[in-house]
Interface confidence: medium
């Protein structure tokens, strides 16, 4: 397997709306049209898929209908946006990237990022 | 049994277009590449066009880019080529190829299956 | 465009001979090289992938070897059911391109 590097901040805050966004920038060696991102998360050494997009360079990512994440990409960069995001989903987001075509295959993981989110506190009851 | 069967060649007027086909069967169509190759009379192997196994990547060879276009339905396990503003010189066999990428990690691309063929011939 | 030049166009031995094929590069292409059989009136077959990787089923009397720039196509002992035209094909970029055929008699 080609290995590639991958960076992508190592903390980020949800915002109080559940939403938490960051950059995914890989080091191209290849000459690949095609990527794969998939966002991976880890908690209590379980790791899980939250989403995955193929995209041709220069054009969006395209995940599926029902994702919580969306994306934009710009040359070897990729703006990853996780929504409805609460406490319990805090963990280790690691953004993995993937040349798909054409050859050869390059692999990148990067280290991840931390994201912290802090579920909103309820409106206290008014008197009014 | 694995299998690419090609159709919807023939006999067609310069400046004219064809469509041709590519039904796939016995593998799993979307997970491969797919080529179409070309070989005119007498001639060697002419690589003509690729496609993704999105179909969102496609590929041509400068002697066909605008005017072919190469195109898939996973959902019909069949490959197309259509062919616009045909001239004498694309005369040829033209071959449906299954890409396989191999090596340990996907490093290298060979067209291990290949159809047997449609013959275009372009004349007035 | 990466030029992929064989030689030679053709040639004649006997049967049991041992039969060799050169394909060039115009470019550094690595080990990104496959060669293709293909008989009169047929589809090519695939031989040998990766440059020397011999495809399942194929007989092992065919080989290949070599990286860069140079390559070679090996029949060790030329046997009546070889008579064909040899192709080399590279996959290091597009455009994807061939040799231009090598092809094999029997004397």
């Known amino acids: 397997c080609k290995a590639m590097h991958v960076a992508q901040p190592a903390v980020v805050l949800a915002s109080s709306r559940g939403i938490a966004s960051f950059v995914c920038e890989y080091a191209s060696p290849g000459k690949a049209t095609e990527v794969r991102v998939t966002v991976l998360r880890q908690a209590d050494s379980q790791v899980t898929e939250v989403c995955a997009a193929t995209y041709m360079m220069g054009n969006e990512l395209t995940f599926l209908d029902d994702s919580i994440c969306t994306g934009t990409s710009s040359g070897n960069q990729v703006n990853l946006t996780i929504q409805g995001l609460r406490a319990m989903d805090t963990g280790l987001y690691i953004c993995k990237v993937e040349l798909m075509y054409p050859p050869p295959y390059y692999l990148g993981i990067g280290n991840g990022t931390q994201i912290y989110v802090i579920d909103p506190e309820p409106c206290p009851d008014s008197d009014f | 049994e694995v299998q690419l069967v090609e159709s919807g060649g023939g006999l067609v007027q310069p400046g004219g277009s064809l469509r041709l086909s590519c039904a796939a069967s016995?593998?799993?169509?979307?997970?491969?590449?797919m080529h179409w190759v070309r070989q005119a009379p007498g001639k060697g192997l002419e690589w003509v066009s690729a496609?993704?196994?999105?179909?969102?990547?496609?590929y041509y060879a400068d002697s066909v880019k605008g005017r072919f276009t190469i195109s898939r339905d996973n959902s019909k396990n069949t490959l197309y080529l259509q062919m616009n503003s045909l001239r004498a010189e694309d005369t040829a066999v033209y071959y449906c190829?299954?890409?396989?990428?191999?090596?340990?990690?996907?490093?290298?691309?060979?067209?291990?299956?290949w159809g047997q063929g449609t013959l275009v011939t372009v004349s007035s | 465009d990466i030029q992929m030049t064989q030689s030679p166009s053709s040639l004649s031995a006997s049967v049991g001979d041992r039969v060799t094929i050169t394909c060039q590069a115009s470019?550094?292409?690595?080990?990104?090289l496959n060669w293709y059989q293909q008989k009169p009136g047929k589809a090519p077959k695939l031989l040998i992938y990766?440059?020397?990787n011999l495809e399942t089923g194929v007989p092992s009397r065919f080989s290949g070897s070599g990286s860069g720039t140079d390559f070679t196509f090996t029949i060790s002992s030329l046997q009546p059911e070889d008579i064909a035209t040899y192709y080399c094909?590279?996959?290091?970029?597009?455009?994807?391109?061939f040799g231009q055929g090598t092809k094999v008699e029997i004397k």
């Open positions: 190829a299954r890409g396989r990428l191999f090596g340990l990690a996907l490093y290298g691309e060979a067209f291990d299956v």
């Open positions: 016995g593998f799993t169509f979307s997970s491969y590449v």
């Open positions: 496609i993704t196994w999105s179909g969102r990547g496609t």
């Open positions: 470019k550094d292409i690595s080990n990104y």
């Open positions: 990766d440059a020397s």
């Open positions: 094909q590279q996959f290091n970029s597009f455009p994807l391109t």
